[in-house]
């Protein structure tokens, strides 16, 4: 018995009930005062949360009962109150006090997982011991009562590529599994109280575990051999046709990148499509059928993220061979050169050759070429490109002629080409030197001798390498005239002088002066060219400027070769 | 070189199980998967599943899903086929082929074959 | 019934050139090689043709392997009494997720 040491007359025991039972009435214990000699003069009552309802007692001798099935994780503990009353006096014959009512357990509960669902995302080919995740029961027994939520944790389902630790719930790999093959595992596991002991309750949940890629397959060629066509006339960047390799990965393991081997010409590459992972052949530079009008190249695919302990795997990369077969194009005439400077002296009869241009058919079929010539009637063509005059050439008139020649192929005149000629016609020392301009020459009435009376210059319409060079000389056929004389100044000029003191304007009014001009030219032209002097009345001043307002008679000079 | 050798030919009634082996040798047993094939008398190939050697990852063909278990043993180099609840349709040889280092690479070399018979 | 449709015999005599087809569909052909194996009775088969054309060592060029769409086919020139085999033809199949055979061409060599 239990003595309560406040309340010094109260006597009770530890009051248990076990959970779950099924009679309509349990007898928990007694409730008695020390005073109570049983005869019946004291009244017991229950008071507090449970009292009448679940818990009732017997107000002569003070049992307690319980009269309802009591669930323990419901409800564990219950705290009552107890009084006992004298009968005859209706005092109080203790002090109220406060007891408990404690509900002993059962193995009532199965463990439960609380947290479903459980998913799993592990890489393939994980080693043994990897951790996967870890599942955990709760059981709502109570954990100081015997096992009673003991747990142990085992697998129902998964292997052997999984194991769980019996008392944490961990679940581990325990074989490497490969995504290629199976990628999502369901896996059981079972939660059992008591320690497994019998009388042990269970209870399972389900773990979907899915394996993630890790890139240990290559990419494939699914053909060892690709044949394509190509258009001579393709202009750069032209899909030639597509390529494929396959990979067993998936997302970015399996993206994949294509390369070109064995092509020193660089004429193809290689681009990816993106969404399909194809790899398209293009044209890097322009095919010419006539030239080679086949490649053999060799293509190689590897993924373009590849870990470094993953490298075993991918090497050797996987090739495929690529035959690229140009087709042949009609193709226009080609000229020998992009442009022809051709050279004529002038002064040729008609039907001199000027020079020659060639235009060929670069097709295998070698169409001889037909010809036409624009730009110029002074010209022609024929059959073999051969240039010839129609006129003679005068460089004075024209020294260069634009033409255009048009080759055309005599099997189809729809192929045609053109070429620009440029025909330069050079010198040849046709003319002689003449006086630059008209002179219109006086000399004073007055005039001294030795002074000087006209400065004279030429031209030569010749066109001339090095600098002209002219040459004067007074004509030796001019033996009459000794009134003046010409020195050669040697810079392309000469001066007239008077050779005498005084002229009558009346007895002798103009005087024509024969002059011969040379040039440097191979051979040299000479020219014989008259000076017309005429005399003037200059008066005290020796001034001529005012001789050509005297409405004198103007004679032209001449020129004779 | 490259070889794989079977067990012998076995013997069965309906409903028993029987188990296949098929040692391999001459190359990296991990790094290859192994296929198993069969052929019944007089007619063609049938393929059964495929294993990874490397862990043991399986792929069974729908027809012998829940009837078939394909095992390994890294430490022998060796493949186990094993087909449970025989019937007289499971006569036939079986073969084990080394396949490519994807799934879908031809089979280069392959087992001399396991005759089993179903017979009550 | 087999996945891929082969015919189940052909003849021809020694010297000639025969071929035999094998038709599938787009998940196995249309998208996989295409196999080819040789198997003389009692013995287990051996890989003729691989990835659709390519020969391994030791297989005379006699045999060549094409293949085109959803079709594939296997051409013996110059034929020898010693080509008198049955032939089947074998790609992986990615909706069934599997291998598919042929159901196999048994040729005779006449002669």
């Known amino acids: 018995d239990y003595k309560d040491d406040d309340d010094k007359g109260w006597v009770w025991n530890q009051f248990f009930v076990p959970e779950e039972m099924n009679t309509t009435s349990h007898h928990i214990g007694q409730l008695r005062s020390d005073l109570d000699n049983g005869n019946n003069s004291f009244q017991y009552k229950l008071l507090g949360a449970g009292a009448g309802s679940t818990f009732i007692i017997d107000e002569r001798t003070g049992d307690i009962y319980a009269i309802q099935k009591l669930d323990r994780e419901e409800r564990s503990l219950y705290i009552l109150r107890a009084q006992v009353i004298d009968i005859a006096t209706g005092r109080a014959v203790e002090p109220e006090s406060e007891f408990v009512i404690k509900v002993s357990d059962i193995n009532d509960n199965e463990p439960r997982f609380l947290d479903e669902p459980y998913e799993a995302i592990v890489p393939e080919m994980s080693p043994e011991g990897t951790f996967v995740i870890k599942v955990t029961a709760n059981d709502a027994d109570d954990p100081s009562t015997g096992y009673h939520a003991r747990i142990l944790y085992n697998l129902e389902r998964g292997q052997p590529y999984f194991s769980v630790e019996p008392t944490t719930g961990v679940i581990r790999i325990s074989s490497k599994m490969d995504r290629e093959l199976q990628d999502t595992y369901c896996v059981i596991i079972q939660a059992k109280d008591m320690l497994g002991q019998p009388g042990a309750l269970s209870g399972t949940t389900t773990v979907s575990i899915k394996l993630s890629d890790i890139n240990d397959n290559k990419p494939i060629f699914k053909e060892s051999f690709y044949r394509f066509t190509i258009s001579e006339s393709a202009p750069i960047g032209t899909s030639i046709g597509k390529i494929m390799a396959y990979d067993d990965d998936i997302g970015e393991n399996a993206e994949m990148e294509y390369s070109i081997e064995d092509d020193d010409s660089k004429i193809f590459d290689i681009i990816i499509d993106n969404d399909t992972q194809e790899g398209i052949v293009i044209l890097k530079k322009k095919v010419d059928f006539e030239q080679q009008s086949y490649y053999g190249i060799r293509a190689k695919v590897k993924n373009c993220h590849v870990d470094e302990e993953l490298a075993p795997a991918h090497v050797n990369a996987s090739t495929t061979y690529i035959k690229v077969q140009v087709e042949d194009e009609d193709e226009p005439p080609v000229f020998l050169l992009p442009y022809y400077i051709l050279e004529i002296p002038e002064g040729k009869p008609y039907g001199t050759i000027v020079g020659t241009v060639s235009a060929t058919d670069p097709d295998r079929r070698q169409s001889p070429m037909r010809y036409y010539l624009t730009g110029s009637k002074m010209f022609d063509i024929n059959d073999n490109g051969t240039i010839i005059t129609t006129n003679m050439l005068d460089r004075e008139v024209s020294a260069w002629y634009n033409l255009t020649v048009t080759a055309t192929e005599t099997y189809n005149v729809q192929q045609i080409s053109s070429a620009h000629v440029y025909v330069q016609v050079f010198n040849i020392n046709d003319n002689a030197p003449e006086f630059s301009q008209f002179y219109e020459t006086y000399v004073c009435e007055n005039a001294e001798s030795g002074e000087i009376v006209q400065i004279i210059s030429a031209i030569d319409r010749d066109e001339s390498i090095e600098d002209h060079h002219f040459y004067f000389n007074h004509s030796l056929e001019d033996t009459n005239n000794s009134s003046f004389m010409l020195t050669d100044n040697q810079d392309n000029t000469a001066v007239i002088l008077s050779n005498r003191t005084g002229f009558n304007l009346k007895e002798e009014p103009v005087f024509y002066m024969i002059i011969l001009i040379a040039d440097n030219g191979i051979p040299s032209l000479t020219s014989t060219n008259t000076l017309t002097i005429q005399v003037c009345d200059c008066g005290d001043s020796r001034n001529t400027e005012t001789c050509a307002n005297k409405g004198l008679l103007f004679i032209m000079g001449f020129r004779t070769e | 070189q490259v070889q794989l050798v079977q067990s012998g030919a076995e013997v069965k009634k309906p409903g028993a199980s029987v188990k296949v082996s098929c040692k391999a040798s001459g190359y990296t047993f991990t790094s290859y998967y192994i296929h198993w094939v069969r052929q019944a008398p007089g007619q063609g190939l049938e393929w059964m599943g495929i294993i990874n050697p490397s862990g043991g990852s399986t792929r069974y063909a729908q027809k012998f899903q829940g009837r078939v278990t394909m095992t390994r043993d890294t430490s022998t180099s060796t493949v186990f086929m094993e087909l449970s609840s025989l019937r007289s349709e499971d006569t036939a040889v079986y073969y084990c082929?080394?396949?490519?280092?994807?799934?879908?690479?031809?089979?280069?070399?392959w087992g001399q074959g396991t005759l089993v018979t179903v017979s009550s | 019934q087999s996945a891929l449709t082969q015919p189940p015999s052909a003849t021809g005599t020694p010297g000639q050139r025969v071929t035999i087809s094998c038709s599938g569909s787009?998940?196995?052909?249309?998208?996989?090689?295409v196999n080819w194996y040789k198997q003389l009775p009692g013995t287990a088969p051996k890989v003729l043709i691989y990835t659709n054309n390519q020969r391994p060592s030791g297989v005379p060029d006699r045999f060549s392997g094409s293949k085109s769409g959803t079709s594939a086919s296997l051409a013996i020139s110059g034929l020898q009494s010693e080509d008198e085999s049955d032939y089947y033809c074998a790609a992986w199949d990615d909706s069934l997720n599997g291998w598919v055979f042929g159901g196999g061409t048994k040729l005779t060599v006449l002669g």
């Open positions: 787009s998940s196995n052909i249309g998208r996989n090689f």
């Open positions: 082929a080394r396949g490519g280092i994807q799934l879908w690479l031809h089979f280069d070399y």
